[in-house]
């Protein structure tokens, strides 16, 4: 594939990554799939600066990120190490709350209205953010 050197139309560039901000809601798995079909992934937050950039764009709205613990431990969708990486949970979170009555606990992470993170039921239809890195090989065939 060819290297992507600029962001696609309607994506926003920041620190050598491209971001796309949804304006509708999907369940976490559907949002995850949407990003993958765009040759991207749900946003992976690795620094204060990236947190603030994303927060600036999404506003005070619940928004999915690429972090989940559906298979046990918390994992970032791109393989970034969770334990040693940036975290910005709300106080008392994550709590894997079972009291919502929807079955199971809470396995997917989202930005809350103040930007800090919460775990929630993955089926909730929240907005989402896709991210793809510039300079990575894209899956599209090169133009002839």
């Amino acid at each position: 594939g060819s290297e992507r050197t600029c962001c696609p139309v309607n994506w926003v560039e920041h620190e050598r990554s491209c971001y796309w901000f949804s304006r509708s809601g999907k369940a976490w798995a559907d949002a995850d799939n949407y990003c993958r079909l765009e040759d991207a992934h749900l946003v992976v937050v690795t620094s204060w600066e990236e947190q603030k950039f994303v927060q600036h764009h999404i506003g005070p709205v619940n928004t999915w990120m690429g972090l989940h613990d559906q298979n046990g431990p918390w994992k970032w969708v791109d393989g970034t190490d969770y334990e040693t990486g940036f975290k910005n949970w709300r106080p008392e979170q994550p709590d894997d709350w079972y009291g919502h009555g929807l079955g199971g606990g809470e396995d997917c992470a989202h930005f809350t209205d103040d930007g800090r993170w919460n775990d929630d039921v993955c089926q909730r239809p929240y907005r989402w953010v896709c991210e793809t890195e510039l300079d990575k090989a894209s899956q599209e065939p090169p133009l002839l």
């Epitope: 204060w48 600066e49 603030k52 600036h56 005070p60 106080p91 930007g115």
Partner: antibody, heavy 119, light 107 residues
């Protein structure tokens, strides 16, 4: 109402240590990031350090890195600044400040405590 | 580190005048720019946050604008209680740096 009250300042010799405290009241202390900011006599404001609401992360200005340590005791609603290897240039009024968690500004400040480093 | 350059460093003006203070960041800080007012012997007081949002209780004669690297604090009609020193501060990236301050004095 929100109150932040610093204490522990005083005169100390170069190379010695001092611990500042900031007693918080009127809000849920454990939900907020807290900062120390200092101001040398007749000079401007200098950011010193921050600690996250749960104490899990801290960042420092280069000028104090390795010498100062920020900590907090959420059960006592108190913020601390341990200052070691003090230098003359650390002489300043030290303020603690509460950070708004959604927009990252300092919405409440203490009255300040003066630290004088002199032989 | 992000450098914050504030200008002017001081100005002499009169009650009723319009005052503009500028702050320039050495790199893009989006809108994470705050303004504080400080009077002698007192702690700083928040005026504006996220570049243009007025803190509760602050008079509407204060306004802020800008994004990216260039920001402005404006006092539309200076009042006697506004004579003070004003600081900008970026809260995008640690260390959270302040500008050098602007002292607004009576002419």
């Amino acid at each position: 109402q929100v109150q932040l009250v610093e204490s522990g300042g005083g005169v100390v010799q170069p190379g010695r240590s001092l611990r500042l405290s900031c007693a918080a009241s009127g809000f849920t202390f454990s939900s907020y990031g807290m900062h120390w900011v200092r101001q040398a006599p007749g000079k401007g404001l200098e950011w010193v350090t921050v600690i996250w609401h749960d104490g899990s992360n801290a960042y420092y200005a280069d000028s104090v890195k390795g010498r100062f340590t920020i900590s907090r005791d959420n059960s006592k609603n108190t913020l601390y600044l341990q200052m070691n290897s003090l230098r003359a240039e650390d002489t300043a009024v030290y303020y603690c400040a509460r950070e708004n968690s959604s927009s990252y500004y300092f919405d409440y400040w203490g009255q300040g405590t003066l630290v004088t480093v002199s032989s | 580190d992000i450098q914050m350059t504030q200008s002017p460093s001081s100005l002499s003006t009169s009650v009723g005048d319009r005052v503009t203070i500028t702050c320039r960041a050495s790199q893009n800080i989006i809108s994470y720019l705050n303004w504080y007012q400080q009077k002698p012997g007192k702690a700083p007081k928040l005026l504006m946050y996220v570049a243009s949002r007025l803190q509760s209780g602050v008079p509407s004669r204060f306004s802020g604008s800008g994004s990216g690297t260039d920001f402005t604090l404006t006092i539309s009609s200076l009042q006697a209680e506004d004579f003070a020193t004003y600081y900008c501060q970026q809260s995008y990236s640690t260390p959270y740096t302040f500008g050098g301050g602007t002292k607004v004095a009576i002419k």
